[in-house]
């Protein structure tokens, strides 16, 4: 009982820490000891350095009374635990002043940090680890640590898939601190997207810890955890481009202007997201590559804005497509090339439809941004021509995982919209039958994110052949 | 009946609640509009620990503003049931564990700022924008007070799946965990691995959702 | 350091087909573009095409549609051009170049094919 | 296609000399445009890149300006080794075009 008091105590104080960064610009600017990296059983004195230090409101404002009830109850004395009790009696801790001072933010980002990891080690307190014949816990360094990067959506994948084993990611700059991400967590793979976009110049490293499964206290031979670096990454240099998108194009006599997406990065600033121009401005050039649609000799231009203007020969009718580069850059400068769009492409009942499920996907991606949809789905990335009704079928069936995952009833309504709408249109080509084409099984599982990507490039191929 | 902690929130979760979603569901439209809206009832009333019970005091009050609105008679019923039923719970002693006494004991203004803005003006912030945030809130508000009656409730371990193991983290309610096909097998396309720890209301016994899984070779 | 290194000069006869090589190394092949670029004895520079290794698209001048294939082997980072049908006024230093979108950064030494009877 | 029209076609200057060579294109190409310089007998050698900026490793004196269809590729003094000839290309649309060349001589 006294546990789960424990537990509803660090909870409430992580959403006042969370409250409290609401705030940052009404507290006073100074610089407060900052516990990183605490040592393992020196938390709860950290917890106490946290706790001791003077957060103060800047007195501005009508957010004083808020600002000091909360802080308040962020001195309030915690229920006490075994482990606390325990790490008391600790001499060896280091002192609060030995720890690095940072202004209200980042103390702010600290404590939370704390709070979280104390309460991973209360959960895996309750576990057991695996032990070998010798009674030690046996644990391995993760490896082929591989940074996996589109448009500065930025993911550390490791391998291996944990057996009785838990793995914690730390991620700094070169010159900043280390900032634990992922705690405790059998994924092989963690989202540093976060981190990275606070600044997508800087370069980063990443460390990946390897703990036993039950027991996160107990570390490798040295008393220390196993963990293995990644590569740097300067996501502003290395992130992939991804493949852009035709927003429209418009003929005006023998002239034709070819708009190009703005893709939004989740790269911030005054709170709202960048678009990859805002973040490359230009630094960031497309190609275009256009054609008759009745012949096969290619033409190309270049724009460092979005669109292109460029003459055709009236009355033909011209397919396009387009690609991102980075010029300044030595590797990773090129985007794949964007879906084929052509004009006088009759808009049909069946094109229609799929216009429509397009506008479905793009809903359902806004409505679980702000679920935490785990899920990994089967998607075929690179859909051949000859497989696309196969590989439809299998979007189709994944997306209702999607559907029984969030518990949503407006996914589950779009969902189930969005399938009739596919399904009118694919019987529409009578009974299709494709072969040698992979089983939905034999496809790679991807994130949401990823798996909505393909699904609407699918559909573009749908769009522009119906 | 004032014992919610008792029946674990069945009153909250069979009445309350009910309309909420109901007068929520009936607002689905609203919304894309509201985003940016910024309304000083939020900025000067949160629902903050050992604040709760004012904060639903002084929003069940609001709510019963919008009863003058010329809407549906069921609309107005839910609104009604969400206002009284809010003030009765509150009302009933020790509900808000520990925390009404002195929520509720504080001075209260005759009438806040905010109650003496006209309707007219009411109109300008955009009635139902503020009407559906004023319910989400109230939602959350009592979500997190009935949270800590149901924080000690657990799980048993879960069912077997063929061909799948699964490796609890935690065993709490509202914990989401996954199946993992075992080696040579897959997830059969269209099925999920996810099993919830959710609770049974009639019961007030928590188990895990039964997930759609087929693991196929 | 980056280089191209293209294949040694070539006589041929009227009618009969070539294929120059340039072997690029120091750099990642398929994030360039490779040019090729005629020059005439005692005359400028003429485009001939590009190919995009990435996605092996090619792009020709209307003048060498037809004359010029462009191809690629990513495995040993080699550009290919093949002229067919040669006819003296074929005669010409050909070069390859690395695009880098904004210019041609780096040249190969060039070729020359000489089509004489 | 987007025709490259560069002047003079030749050109007599002394070391020390202030030369400007201009490239004048069909259409707007914004400052998609290259200068090159190449010596008898050898590759061409990339100067000038975006209408402005000078390539890795080319001395200062060389610079280029211009944006649209006006373009200027100046030495501001010449030394024995510029004697060449120079190129502009436009890497806009395709054909990529080039100029016809200026032939740099010693006076």
């Known amino acids: 009982q006294g546990q789960d008091r424990h537990m509803i105590r660090m909870r409430q104080l992580i959403d006042i820490v969370d409250q409290l960064k609401n705030y940052v610009n009404d507290l006073v600017p100074e610089f407060l000891p900052a516990p990183e990296d605490v040592e393992t059983n020196c938390e709860w004195s950290a917890f106490s350095c946290f706790q001791k230090a003077q957060l103060k409101s800047a007195n501005t404002g009508n957010n004083e009374r808020i600002i000091n009830v909360s802080i308040k109850k962020l001195k309030r004395k915690p229920p006490s635990t075994n482990a606390g009790r325990r790490q008391k009696h600790r001499l060896t801790c280091p002192s609060c002043d030995s720890y690095e001072k940072k202004p209200p933010k980042e103390f702010l980002e600290r404590f939370k940090s704390l709070l979280q990891k104390m309460i991973h080690q209360h959960l895996s307190s309750r576990t057991h680890g695996s032990e070998d014949s010798s009674g030690t816990t046996n644990t391995v360094a993760a490896y082929n640590l591989t940074w996996k990067s589109t448009n500065f959506k930025t993911i550390l994948e490791w391998e291996p898939k944990p057996v009785n084993q838990v793995y914690t990611v730390q991620i700094s700059t070169k010159s900043g601190d280390w900032k634990s991400k992922c705690f405790y967590t059998t994924d092989t793979e963690c989202d540093l997207t976060d981190e990275i976009v606070k600044d997508v110049k800087q370069t980063y490293l990443a460390r990946v810890f390897s703990y036993p499964a039950g027991n996160v206290e107990s570390t490798g031979s040295a008393g220390e955890p196993l963990y293995e670096n990644s590569p740097e990454f300067t996501p502003y240099l290395e992130t992939n481009l991804g493949q852009p998108t035709i927003q429209s194009f418009e003929q005006v006599g023998t002239k034709v202007n070819v708009t190009v997406e703005d893709e939004r990065t989740l790269v911030r600033r005054n709170n709202t997201f960048l678009s990859l121009r805002d973040v490359f401005g230009k630094d960031l050039i497309y190609t275009l590559y256009y054609w008759k649609s009745s012949s096969s000799g290619k033409k190309t231009a270049k724009t460092n804005t979005n669109e292109f203007l460029i003459d055709v020969d009236k009355g033909e009718n011209y397919c396009f497509s387009v690609q991102a580069v980075i010029p300044s850059r030595t590797v990773n400068r090129k985007s794949t090339d964007s879906p084929v769009e052509c004009m006088g492409q009759e808009k049909g009942e069946f094109r229609e439809n799929w216009v429509n499920v397009i506008s479905d996907l793009k809903k359902i991606e806004d409505l679980i941004q702000s679920m935490h949809i785990d899920a990994t789905l089967y998607t075929e990335s690179d859909v051949h021509p000859s497989c696309k009704v196969t590989a439809m079928k299998c979007f189709l069936l994944e997306l209702q995982v999607i559907s029984l995952e969030s518990g949503d009833a407006s996914i589950h309504d779009t969902v189930e919209n969005l399938i009739i709408l596919a399904n009118n249109s694919l019987s529409s080509n009578g009974n299709v039958t494709e072969s040698g084409c992979k089983e939905c099984e034999e496809l790679e599982e991807k994130n949401i994110k990823e798996f909505l990507q393909s699904f609407v490039h699918i559909v573009q191929m749908f769009i522009n052949t119906s | 009946d004032c014992d919610i902690e008792g029946k674990d929130g069945k009153q909250y979760e069979s009445v309350l609640m009910v309309s909420i979603d109901q007068l929520l569901d009936s607002m689905k439209e609203i919304g894309s509009n509201c985003l940016n809206n910024e309304f000083n009832f939020f900025k000067r009333h949160i629902c903050d620990a050992n604040k709760e019970g004012m904060f639903l005091f002084r929003a069940a009050r609001k709510l019963r503003q919008f009863l003058k609105m010329n809407s549906t008679g069921d609309f107005d019923l839910h609104l009604l049931k969400v206002s009284e039923g809010t003030t009765i719970l509150l009302n009933c002693t020790g509900q808000v564990k520990g925390r009404k006494p002195a929520a509720l004991g504080e001075a209260q203004p005759t009438k806040s700022l905010e109650e003496n803005k006209s309707l007219k003006e009411q109109k300008k912030l955009n009635d139902l924008c503020f009407l559906k945030r004023l319910l989400q809130e109230i939602k959350t508000c009592w979500n997190k007070i009935l949270m800590g009656t149901k924080e000690h409730i657990t799980c048993p371990p879960p069912m077997s799946v063929e061909h799948a193991d699964i490796w609890v983290k935690s065993y709490s309610l509202y914990s989401r965990e996954r199946y993992i096909c075992n080696s040579g097998f897959k997830r059969k396309a269209g099925t999920s691995s996810l099993t919830e720890c959710v609770l049974n209301k009639a019961t007030n016994v928590a188990h895990w959702t039964t997930p759609s899984l087929k693991c196929i070779r | 350091q980056i280089q191209l290194v293209q294949s040694g000069g070539e006589v041929k006869k009227p009618g009969a087909s070539v294929r120059v090589s340039c072997k690029a190394s120091g750099y990642s092949f398929t994030d360039y573009n490779v040019y090729w670029v005629r020059q005439s004895p005692g005359k400028g520079l003429e485009w001939i095409g590009y190919i995009d290794p990435y996605n092996g698209i090619t792009i020709y001048d209307q003048n060498f549609k037809g004359k010029a294939t462009l191809t690629v082997d990513k495995s040993t980072s080699t550009a290919y051009m093949e002229l067919s049908s040669l006819r003296s006024e074929d005669t010409a230093v050909y070069f390859c170049?690395?695009?880098?979108?904004?210019?041609?950064?780096?040249w190969g030494q060039g070729t020359t094919v000489t089509v004489s009877s | 296609d987007i025709q490259m029209t560069q002047s003079p076609a030749s050109l007599s200057a002394s070391v020390g000399d202030r030369v400007t060579i201009t490239c004048l294109a069909s259409q707007t190409i914004d400052t998609w445009l290259a200068w090159y310089l190449q010596k008898p007998g050898k590759s061409p050698q990339l100067l000038i890149y975006a209408a402005t900026n000078l390539a890795d490793g080319v001395p200062s004196r060389f610079s280029g300006s211009g944006s649209g269809t006006d373009f200027s590729f100046t030495i501001s003094s010449l030394q024995p080794e510029d004697f060449a000839t120079y190129y502009c290309?436009?890497?806009?649309?395709?054909?990529?075009?080039f100029g016809q060349g200026t032939k740099l001589e010693i006076k």
């Open positions: 170049a690395r695009d880098v979108t904004t210019a041609l950064d780096f």
């Open positions: 290309q436009q890497v806009y649309s395709s054909p990529f075009t």
